[in-house]
Interface confidence: low
């Protein structure tokens, strides 16, 4: 293609020289350069007469010679107006003008469809000087034309601030039909009508379309481009293409597969990503989508315990991202999990079931009957409690966490202690005197820390007081106990 101003330049080989005079392109006369003798060269095969009025721009020079003879108007000479040729052939055309010698530095530029053409290797300008005038012949050559070279070409010359423009030369590149719209692959519902479109252009026109289904022609008579094929419905996959014919020959479009939508295949590789006491994170690999996008998926969860009632929990989720966190499960329980996904046609079968387990839970009940004593003789606080009732799924009790907060005159200090699972008492050192100690206890399993007991407060006096009685968890409805010894 010719390189236009403001477009990316494409390199071309230098034109190999004048075409042989006998070469013709699709019966259109080929223009050749004139001989170098004479200042008014004649253009070979020129289809216009020298005396015909010129439609291009004319410049009337204001300058006169020494003898004061007025100079003739300047204009490009007429040349061939229309060239028709096949793709990939070479073409050369020119425009010529005679310019008085008083004008220096005249240049001719080539324009196509209103844009200046850059790339000097396409254009050659030759000068044939004489006593009074110089004949200038500008030749433009294209070694292998393409469809994009179609268009209207003109020469321009600037003299004395005037622009001289030649008549246009129309280049028409003909070739095999060129597809501007080809049929597209589609996924269709079984026995449902759909349309396919095919459009191709020349030149030369007209372009006729034949449709092909699975290697057999669908229409006996061609249709003028563009053509829309209405297929009443399919029961199985088919391949369609279209043939575009013009006087130059035949072009065949790409073959496109028309798939029949079906229910998806079941998901595969359901796997456990993470397990906690009350949730299981699963992922899966979706099966084949049945030529229709997945809409959503369903996670089915059954208790694997043989004594369970066999009920199934169903969790619906979006098809992406193939990941779901199943929540509200029991701790330390076994579950069977399957996944099914749907598209617009329907639901897939359920994936192979996998077995998953939740981990131990944290205790759900706080220790009971928390009692706090001040043992002043050893400067300790003794704590006693009762083991909370634990559910089997809460897991095995591994110990207790004791929080004791010491508050005195704007100071607040919280400490944590740990005791083994067999204990039901603990001893903590007095941290601050003349202060309130608030004690709370939580049971601990491998599943986590349970709720803390209600706070029990005891006042730790200054040194020298007597140990009277314990503080303990209040009975329901009682006020917050603070025992001041």
């Amino acid at each position: 293609a010719i390189t236009e101003a403001r477009e990316e330049a494409k390199p071309y080989p230098l034109f190999p020289g004048p075409f042989p005079g006998s070469l013709q392109t699709d019966h259109t006369p080929l223009l050749s350069l004139p001989h170098a003798s004479g200042y008014q060269p004649a253009l070979m095969f020129s289809p216009t007469q020298p005396g015909r009025p010129h439609t291009g721009n004319v410049a009337i020079p204001q300058v006169t010679s020494v003898e004061s003879k007025p100079l003739p108007p300047l204009a490009f000479k007429h040349t061939v107006g229309h060239i028709i040729l096949s793709e990939h052939k070479g073409v050369k055309f020119n425009c010529s003008i005679s310019v008085p010698n008083i004008y220096q530095d005249t240049t001719i530029s080539w324009w196509k469809d209103g844009k200046e053409l850059l790339g000097a290797h396409h254009a050659i300008t030759q000068f044939y000087p004489d006593d009074e005038v110089t004949a200038i012949i500008a030749s433009f050559s294209i070694t292998s034309v393409q469809r994009s070279d179609n268009g209207s070409y003109i020469c321009k010359m600037k003299i004395n601030n005037e622009e001289i423009v030649s008549d246009p030369i129309y280049i028409e590149v003909q070739g095999l039909p060129h597809f501007t719209k080809q049929p597209e692959s589609m996924n269709v519902t079984r026995n449902t009508a759909f349309n396919l479109t095919c459009q191709a252009v020349g030149p030369p026109e007209p372009v006729n379309i034949f449709w092909v289904q699975n290697s057999s022609r669908v229409n006996e008579q061609p249709e003028k481009s563009p053509s829309v094929l209405t297929v009443p419905g399919l029961t199985e996959m088919a391949v369609f293409s279209c043939e575009a014919h013009n006087d130059k020959g035949l072009t065949v479009s790409k073959g496109v597969q028309i798939n029949i939508k079906a229910i998806p295949s079941p998901p595969t590789e359901v796997s456990i990503r993470n397990s906690t006491a009350h949730s299981i994170l699963i992922s899966w690999v979706p099966g084949f989508d049945g030529y229709s996008p997945f809409r959503n998926c369903s996670i089915q969860v059954k208790e694997a315990d043989p004594l369970s009632n066999g009920s199934v929990m169903i969790f619906n989720t979006s098809a992406l991202p193939h990941l779901y966190q199943i929540k509200q499960l029991q701790a330390l329980a076994n579950y069977s999990i399957g996944v099914s996904c749907m598209n617009e046609i329907g639901w897939s079968a359920v994936s192979p079931w996998i077995l998953a387990s939740t981990t131990e839970g944290a205790p759900s009940v706080a220790p009971l009957n928390v009692t706090v004593f001040l043992n002043e003789s050893s400067d300790n606080v003794d704590i006693r409690w009762m083991k909370p009732p634990t559910k089997q799924q809460d897991g095995e009790l591994v110990g207790y966490r004791i929080s004791h907060v010491w508050q005195s005159a704007g100071i607040s200090k919280e400490l944590l202690e740990e005791v083994g699972q067999n204990g039901s008492r603990a001893r903590i050192s007095v941290q601050v005197h003349n202060a309130t100690c608030t004690v709370r206890i939580a049971a601990v399993t491998r599943g986590g820390v349970g709720p803390f007991s209600d706070p029990v407060k005891i006042f730790i006096p200054a040194h020298g007081w007597v140990d009277y009685a314990p503080s303990s968890t209040p009975a329901p409805g009682n006020a917050d106990p603070v025992l001041i010894i």
Partner: antibody, heavy 119, light 107 residues
Framework: QVQLVQSGAEVKKPGASVKVSCKAS????????MHWVRQAPGQGLEWIGV????????NYNQKFRGRVTMTRDTSTSTVYMELSSLRSEDTAVYYC????????????WGQGTLVTVSS | DIQMTQSPSSLSASVGDRVTITCQAS??????VAWYQQKPGKAPKLLIY???NRYTGVPSRFSGSGSGTDFTFTISSLQPEDIATYYC?????????FGQGTKLELK
């Protein structure tokens, strides 16, 4: 005072087994869990497993399951860690560490036992 | 497994500098994070437990904070004897994983 004393360094061939001991003193042996941690040369710390001496509760890191065995002898206040099918990447210093309370931090550590696996 | 991502992996600081190390858990570990100090050829030593509690005898320049997934260990004023490798560790779920360690060097 609390002390955890481990057995001496060992050199083993690939495929062999090694048994490292950790003798506890200065506290009530059955009241504290004992963990095992290893450290390959120039690398970080890696948890192997835990044993509760009071009831022989054991929890192993899945990575070592099938190759590691933890036992305890309450009469000598000693815990043992045996690792079988040794490979060169098992070359490391193996530590026992006492867990304070029943959850969380390791307050006392053994001095470490270097196990070298080399053909 | 719960991953404990510790950063930076190494850092240089001067005596008296404030040094901060972070540890990010791949899922919530509540406050069950401990920080340990290890010097070459020695067993690790406990510094901080339950994310923010200083262990007995540990100098007050060492502190910890955070809960859930993000934890921070700070030395408020670096001393020469603090040059060591520091590790975080979670105890929420077995296997009880450590961070990859932060090697602290003197500038």
């Amino acid at each position: 005072q609390v002390q955890l004393v481990q057995s001496g360094a060992e050199v083993k061939k690939p495929g062999a087994s090694v048994k490292v001991s950790c003798k506890a003193s200065g506290y009530t042996f059955v009241s504290y869990w004992m963990h095992w941690v290893r450290q390959a040369p120039g690398q970080g710390l890696e948890w192997i497993g835990v044993i509760d001496p009071s009831d022989n509760y054991i929890n192993y890191n899945q990575k070592f399951r099938g190759r590691v065995t933890m036992t305890r002898d309450t009469s000598t206040s000693t815990v043992y860690m045996e690792l079988s099918s040794l490979r060169s990447e098992d070359t490391a210093v193996y530590y026992c560490a006492r867990e304070a309370g029943t959850r969380g931090y390791f307050d006392y550590w053994g001095q470490g036992t270097l196990v070298t696996v080399s053909s | 497994d719960i991953q404990m991502t510790q950063s930076p992996s190494s850092l240089s600081a001067s005596v008296g500098d404030r040094v901060t190390i972070t540890c990010q858990a791949s899922q919530s570990v509540s406050n069950t994070v401990a920080w340990y100090q290890q010097k070459p050829g020695k067993a690790p030593k406990l510094l901080i437990y339950y994310a923010s509690n200083r262990y007995t005898g540990v100098p007050s320049r060492f502190s910890g904070s955070g809960s859930g997934t993000d934890f921070t260990f700070t030395i408020s004023s670096l001393q020469p004897e603090d040059i060591a490798t520091y590790y975080c560790r979670q105890d929420t779920r077995s296997p009880f994983t450590f961070g990859q360690g932060t090697k602290l060097e003197l500038k």
